[in-house]
């Protein structure tokens, strides 16, 4: 049940992320803001009125508005996070669940071609679940995951664009390709 109510949130490996609490505004009535990592049911950060803010480790930072910052994301930070907010009378004001998913950023795609084999290849070396798209003179040709191979039959003079993207990043490369009829590299 918790997962179905979760806010899907994407973070980039090695980068920081802020888990912002939607539709929440800090007020004098708020006494307790507690963040938990649900896989080990561990409290990771807590704000309490007139008490020192608790952080389980330095990679966490809790802002005054309840937002949790996780610094330098690692793969084991991928988890379901829960924030519980209570007022000065102990009432549960708000609960939100965040499903934090982490991806490695995509690298810049590399375009290479051979006029002899009338073949162009676009490849992305790094990144989690990359999506590659190849365009010729602005027209979409192909979609793939890590490698796209495109073959042509006639002479070619065109501008190719290859984009690589995932939930946390997007990179692109553009190459003008010119191949004569008989084709020499």
């Amino acid at each position: 049940k918790e997962i179905t109510n979760a806010l899907e949130t994407w973070g980039a490996l090695g980068q920081d992320i802020n888990l912002d609490i939607p539709s929440f505004q800090m007020s004098d009535d708020i006494d307790d803001i507690k963040w938990e990592k649900t896989s080990d049911k561990k409290k990771i950060a807590q704000f309490r009125k007139e008490k020192e803010t608790f952080k389980e480790k330095d990679t966490y930072k809790l802002f005054k508005n309840g937002t949790l910052k996780i610094k330098h994301l690692k793969t084991d930070d991928q988890d379901i996070y829960k924030v519980s907010i209570y007022d000065t009378k102990g009432k549960n004001v708000l609960e939100k669940i965040f499903d934090l998913k982490i991806q490695e950023r995509v690298s810049k795609p590399k375009i290479s071609w051979t006029c002899i084999n009338t073949t162009l290849t676009c490849e992305v070396m790094n990144g989690t679940d990359p999506e590659l798209n190849l365009y010729q003179d602005g027209k979409h040709l192909k979609l793939s995951q890590r490698v796209i191979t495109h073959k042509w039959t006639t002479s070619l003079s065109a501008k190719f664009k290859c984009t690589a993207g995932n939930k946390v990043s997007k990179e692109s490369s553009v190459e003008p390709v010119s191949c004569p009829e008989k084709g020499l590299d």
Epitope: D29, D32, K34, K43, S84, Y86, D87, T88, G90, K91, N92, V93, E95
Partner: antibody, heavy 117, light 112 residues
Framework: EVQLVESGGGLVQPGASLKLSCVAS????????MSWVRQTPGKPMEWIGH????????NYAPSLKNRFTISRDNAKTTLYLQMSNVRSEDSATYYC??????????WGQGTLVTVSS | DVVLTQTPVAQPVTLGDQASISCRSS???????????LEWFLQKPGQSPQLLIY???NRFSGVPDRFIGSGSGSDFTLKISRVEPEDWGVYYC?????????FGAGTKLELK
């Protein structure tokens, strides 16, 4: 696993005092508000009151406020209910409960108090 | 004090059928912070009460999804979509919006 174990109940004479205890384990006691609730057969359950995680604030049902006192010792992970000048209508099963996310999310097994001469 | 009226007092039901319990409050249970602190408990024979639902419709951890809480203002319902043997007992509604917090008198779910 959250565990709450009440003790201190028994037979007591009208007008006497009694102190109930509730020992908590399986969670960080000092992080949670705690409540006392009582149940008498044939009557609706009655919320007695609750105490803040650090003991700095208590709130009671007005009808019980002058005779019942809730306290806690976080070092001993123990919740208390001090009952004074007990009456026959105080005969009930007394439960302690941990709050969060609801007002009584986890309950102990209860301790029976019988007020009779 | 806020009075919670539960109906019916007893609910005879067949295994696998749906059961529905109503809880009406003598005043609105909407708190000034916008939340509604209406909870449902089940007390099985010889046991302590256990939390099923908090804030009208939020299932407590480990509670099966056949338990569905709904309602608003002063009119609330607990539905059990397919009654199972472990569901027998007395169901109580509870309000934590207004001091003092109060319980309904209970609804006994029994075998038809």
């Amino acid at each position: 696993e959250v565990q709450l174990v009440e003790s201190g109940g028994g037979l007591v004479q009208p007008g006497a005092s009694l102190k109930l205890s509730c020992v908590a384990s399986g969670f960080t006691f000092s992080d949670y508000w705690m409540s006392w609730v009582r149940q008498t057969p044939g009557k609706p359950m009655e919320w007695i009151g609750h105490i803040k995680y650090d003991g700095s604030y208590t709130n009671y049902a007005p009808s019980l406020k002058n005779r019942f006192t809730i306290s806690r010792d976080n070092a001993k992970t123990t919740l208390y209910l001090q009952m004074s000048n007990v009456r026959s209508e105080d005969s009930a099963t007394y439960y302690c409960a941990r709050e969060a996310p609801g007002a009584a999310s986890y309950w102990g097994q209860g301790t029976l108090v019988t007020v009779s001469s | 004090d806020v009075v919670l009226t539960q109906t019916p007092v007893a609910q005879p039901v067949t295994l696998g059928d749906q059961a529905s319990i109503s809880c009406r409050s003598s005043q609105s249970l909407v708190h000034s912070n916008g939340n509604t602190y209406l909870e449902w408990f089940l007390q099985k024979p010889g046991q302590s009460p256990q939390l099923l639902i908090y804030k009208v419709s939020n299932r407590f951890s480990g509670v099966p999804d056949r338990f569905i809480g709904s309602g608003s203002g002063s009119d609330f319902t607990l539905k059990i979509s397919r009654v199972e043997p472990e569901d027998w007992g007395v169901y109580y509604c509870f309000q934590g919006t207004h001091d003092p917090y109060t319980f309904g008198a209970g609804t006994k779910l029994e075998l038809k």
